[in-house]
C-alpha cells in the first residue's frame, strides 16, 4: 500500500481468482482513543472499533471511502483505491491502446518544434468518475524540470457503437535549449483513476523523435505564362524553431486529381518553392518534415488548381 | 530518405556537401546495423546514449546560431579553445567563433573515425563476420576532415591485447552510431546555418 | 473453490460451426479475464483466444482470427467459444482458463473436424 | 509459430537433477514473467511455477524457476517417478500481451 496523495490510498493486489489479497491496517487520524468506529462509503454498518482497522482486501467491494467517527462525528477519512497486477503486469482498462506507432501505445506525444513544449493525448471509453494526473521529467535518476498542465477532454468521437474521448496535457521542459542534443529522455506518466480503480501508464521519447512540424503557411499558386505549369510557393509554420537556416526543413509537393484512384506527383524539395502542372480539377498540396531528422511528415497545407 | 531530392547548389561552402553525405553514410549505417543486429538491444530507446566527445568537444554550445545566444539555456559552457585555421573558412571573413565552431566539429570527427576504425578491427575478427562498417562512411567522415583541413594531433588508433567480446562490441557499435548520427545531425545544421550567413 | 466445467465438444464436418462452453464457479467471474487454448492430439499447447473481463476487448491467434468469437455473459457466469468454418487442423482438446499469476484450467473438451 | 523453445526430451533416473531450457528474445522472456506447466496424460496442465521462481502452494520444493536474460529453466532436483509428464514453459509478448505464448513442450523421461 503507498499513498498517492493525502488521504488517498493505493493497494496493488495480484489479481485472480480466490487470491488471499493484502491485509491493510488503516489507522484514524485523531488524538482520540475511545469511542472510535469505523464504516465503509455511504453505508453505516459497522465494520469495527477502536483507533485502527484491519481488512483484508481482495476485491473493489473491500475499496473505497473508509470513515472513522465518534459520538456521530467523522474524524478522518482513508480512500482505498485497488491497482491489478495481472500475471506480473499491471491492468491496463482505463485507456485505449491506440497501436501506433505500435502496439501497447497508450500514450501519444507530439511537438511542433525543438522548443521543449509538446502535447501528449489517449483516448477512453468511459465518460465517468474518472480523473488523470500528469507528471514529467527529463530522465529518471537525476530528473530535471517539466512543467505540465491539467489533462483536458480534447475530443469526442462515435467509434461503432461506442463513444470515444480524446484527453490530451501540455508540458514544457523548464530549461530547453533547442538546439541541444538529447542524451536523456523525457518521461512522462499519467495516473489514471476509475471509480476505485488505480493505474499508471508511461511514455519515454527525445524530442526529435516526436516532431512533428505545422503545415507550410501562405500556400500560393502563381501561373507560369504560356504554360500548364505553375509555380507553388509557401512558407515555414510560425512555429517552426528559429533561426530556419539552422532548423531547417525539407518539403514534398504533391498534386492530386480529384479522384483518390488517380495517380499523384510527387516532388521533394528542400526549396519553398518549386514549378509543377495543375491539371484541371486537381489540388496541389504541401507538406513539411524536418530535413536532417526523419521525424514525422506535417498534415498537408491544400490550394485547388484552379 | 531514398527519394528524389532537388538539392541546392553548396557553392561558396565546401563543408555543406560533405555533411550532407556524412549524415546519408551514418543514417544508413545505422539502419544496416538495427536490421542486422535484430537480436541485439540497438534501438534508440534500447541502448544508452552515450556522448564519446562529452567534456572533451562542444560543437553545440561553439556552433550555436547567433539568434540562440539569447537563450539562457544553450549557454552552459563556452569555453573550450581550439586551433583556428581551416579552409571551409577560406573565402570569407570568419569570426573566432566560427573557427572553434569547425574546428570542434573536426575534433569530433577525429575522435569518431578512430572509434570507429578500432571497433571495425574488432570485428573483422569475429567468427560470425555479422557486420562491419561501412568503407563509404569511413571514407565520408575523411572527405569532411579534409574540407574542414585543421592540423591537429594524430591519435593513434587503440590497440587491446584481449580477446574481443564481440557481443559488447556490437551494443558499442550501436550505441556510437546513435550518437554519431545525432552528432552528424548538428553538422548538417550548423553548415547549412554557415552557408546561409 | 474455484472450478471451470467445460461443454459443446464434439465431432464436425469441414466448415461447420460449433459453440463450446465454459461454466465459472466459485469465484466472481466478471472480475477476471479469460483464455481459450487449445491441444491437437500429440502436440502442444496453443493460445487461442483472449477476453477482458468486462468483454469490453478481445483477442485472437492469426490461426482463427475472422472463424472463432470468443464472448462471455457475466450474468451467467459463462465463458463461450463460436467455431465457424472449421477445418480438420482445428482438431484439439480446448481448455479454457482464468487470466492472472495462479490460474485455473477447465477439464478440457475434444473438438474432432472431420468429413 | 512457437517462440519459445524447448528441448523435446531431457531423462533422467530417479533422484538425479534434471533441468528444462525454455530460450525466448527480449520483447518476450527479456521483458515478461514466465510460467512453468506440467501436464500429464489426458489432463489439463497444472501450475508449477509462477513469476519466473515462485511454487503455487502445493508444489512439491524439488521444482523450482529461474530466468536469465531472455532464457528460463526450470530444475527438479531429485527427479521422481511421479514427474514423468509433459512440461511447458510460458510468457508473453510485450506488443500481443495478453496472448500466451507457450514453449515447444519437453517430455521428461524417468528411467529404471
Known amino acids: 500500500i503507498w499513498e498517492l496523495k493525502k488521504d488517498v490510498y493505493v493497494v496493488e493486489l495480484d489479481w485472480y481468482p480466490d487470491a488471499p489479497g493484502e491485509m491493510v491496517v488503516l489507522t484514524c487520524d485523531t488524538p482520540e482513543e475511545d469511542g472510535i468506529t469505523w464504516t465503509l462509503d455511504q453505508s453505516s454498518e459497522v465494520l469495527g472499533s477502536g483507533k485502527t482497522l484491519t481488512i483484508q482486501v481482495k476485491e473493489f467491494g473491500d475499496a473505497g471511502q473508509y470513515t472513522c467517527h465518534k459520538g456521530g462525528e467523522v474524524l478522518s477519512h482513508s480512500l482505498l483505491l485497488l491497482h491489478k497486477k495481472e500475471d506480473g503486469i499491471w491492468s491496463t482498462d482505463i485507456l485505449k491502446d491506440q497501436k501506433e506507432p505500435k502496439n501497447k501505445t497508450f500514450l501519444r506525444c507530439e511537438a511542433k518544434n525543438y522548443s521543449g513544449r509538446f502535447t501528449c493525448w489517449w483516448l477512453t471509453t468511459i465518460s465517468t468518475d474518472l480523473t488523470f494526473s500528469v507528471k514529467s521529467s527529463r530522465g529518471s535518476s537525476d530528473p530535471q524540470g517539466v512543467t505540465c498542465g491539467a489533462a483536458t477532454l480534447s475530443a469526442e468521437r462515435v467509434r461503432g457503437d461506442n463513444k470515444e474521448y480524446e484527453y490530451s496535457v501540455e508540458c514544457q521542459e523548464d530549461s530547453a535549449c533547442p538546439a541541444a542534443e538529447e542524451s536523456l529522455p523525457i518521461e512522462v506518466m499519467v495516473d489514471a483513476v476509475h471509480k476505485l480503480k488505480y493505474e499508471n501508464y508511461t511514455s519515454s521519447f527525445f524530442i526529435r523523435d516526436i516532431i512533428k512540424p505545422d503545415p507550410p503557411k501562405n500556400l500560393q499558386l502563381k501561373p507560369l505564362k504560356n504554360s500548364r505549369q505553375v509555380e507553388v510557393s509557401w512558407e515555414y509554420p510560425d512555429t517552426w524553431s528559429t533561426p530556419h537556416s539552422y532548423f531547417s526543413l525539407t518539403f514534398c509537393v504533391q498534386v492530386q486529381g480529384k479522384s483518390k484512384r488517380e495517380k499523384k506527383d510527387r516532388v521533394f524539395t528542400d526549396k519553398t518553392s518549386a514549378t509543377v502542372i495543375c491539371r484541371k480539377n486537381a489540388s496541389i498540396s504541401v507538406r513539411a518534415q524536418d530535413r536532417y531528422y526523419s521525424s514525422s511528415w506535417s498534415e498537408w497545407a491544400s490550394v485547388p488548381c484552379s | 530518405r531514398n527519394l528524389p531530392v532537388a538539392t541546392p547548389d553548396p557553392g561558396m561552402f565546401p563543408c555543406l556537401h560533405h555533411s550532407q553525405n556524412l549524415l546519408r553514410a551514418v543514417s544508413n549505417m545505422l539502419q544496416k546495423a538495427r536490421q542486422t543486429l535484430e537480436f541485439y538491444p540497438c534501438t534508440s530507446e534500447e541502448i544508452d546514449h552515450e556522448d564519446i566527445t562529452k567534456d572533451k568537444t562542444s560543437t553545440v554550445e561553439a556552433c550555436l546560431p547567433l539568434e540562440l545566444t539569447k537563450n539562457e539555456s544553450c549557454l552552459n559552457s563556452r569555453e573550450t579553445s581550439f586551433i583556428t585555421n581551416g579552409s571551409c573558412l577560406a573565402s570569407r571573413k570568419t569570426s573566432f567563433m566560427m573557427a572553434l565552431c569547425l574546428s570542434s566539429i573536426y575534433e569530433d570527427l577525429k575522435m569518431y573515425q578512430v572509434e570507429f576504425k578500432t571497433m571495425n578491427a574488432k570485428l573483422l575478427m569475429d567468427p560470425k563476420r555479422q557486420i562491419f562498417l561501412d568503407q563509404n562512411m569511413l571514407a565520408v567522415i575523411d572527405e569532411l576532415m579534409q574540407a574542414l583541413n585543421f592540423n591537429s594531433e594524430t591519435v593513434p588508433q587503440k590497440s587491446s591485447l584481449e580477446e574481443p567480446d564481440f557481443y559488447k562490441t556490437k551494443i558499442k557499435l550501436c550505441i556510437l552510431l546513435h550518437a554519431f548520427r545525432i552528432r552528424a545531425v548538428t553538422i548538417d545544421r550548423v553548415m547549412s546555418y554557415l552557408n546561409a550567413s | 473453490q474455484v472450478q471451470l466445467v467445460q461443454s459443446g465438444g464434439g465431432v464436425v464436418q469441414p466448415g461447420r460451426s460449433l459453440r463450446l462452453s465454459c461454466a465459472a464457479s466459485g469465484f466472481t467471474f466478471s472480475s477476471y479475464g479469460m483464455h481459450w487454448v487449445r491441444q491437437a492430439p500429440g502436440k502442444g499447447l496453443e493460445w487461442v483466444a483472449f477476453i477482458r473481463y468486462d468483454g469490453s476487448n478481445k483477442y485472437y491467434a492469426d490461426s482463427v482470427k475472422g472463424r472463432f468469437t470468443i464472448s462471455r455473459d457475466n450474468s451467467k457466469n459463462t465463458l463461450y467459444l463460436q467455431m465457424k468454418s472449421l477445418r480438420a487442423e482445428d482438431t484439439a482438446v480446448y481448455y479454457c482458463?482464468?487470466?492472472?499469476?495462479?490460474?485455473?484450467w477447465g477439464q478440457g473438451t475434444m473438438v474432432t473436424v472431420s468429413s | 509459430s512457437y517462440v519459445l523453445t524447448q528441448p523435446p526430451s531431457v531423462s533422467g533416473t530417479p533422484g538425479q537433477r534434471v533441468t528444462i531450457s525454455c530460450s525466448g528474445g527480449r520483447s518476450n522472456i527479456g521483458s515478461n514473467t514466465v510460467k512453468w506447466y506440467q501436464q500429464l496424460p489426458g489432463t489439463a496442465p497444472k501450475l508449477l511455477i509462477y513469476g519466473n521462481d515462485t511454487r503455487p502452494s502445493g508444489v512439491p520444493d524439488r521444482f523450482s524457476g529461474s530466468k536469465s536474460g531472455t532464457s528460463a529453466s526450470l530444475a527438479i532436483t531429485g527427479v521422481q517417478a511421479e514427474d514423468e509428464a509433459d512440461y511447458y514453459c510460458q510468457s508473453y509478448d510485450r506488443g500481443t500481451h495478453p496472448a500466451l505464448l507457450f514453449g515447444t513442450g519437453t517430455k521428461v523421461t524417468v528411467l529404471g
Open positions: 482458463k482464468t487470466h492472472g499469476s495462479h490460474d485455473n
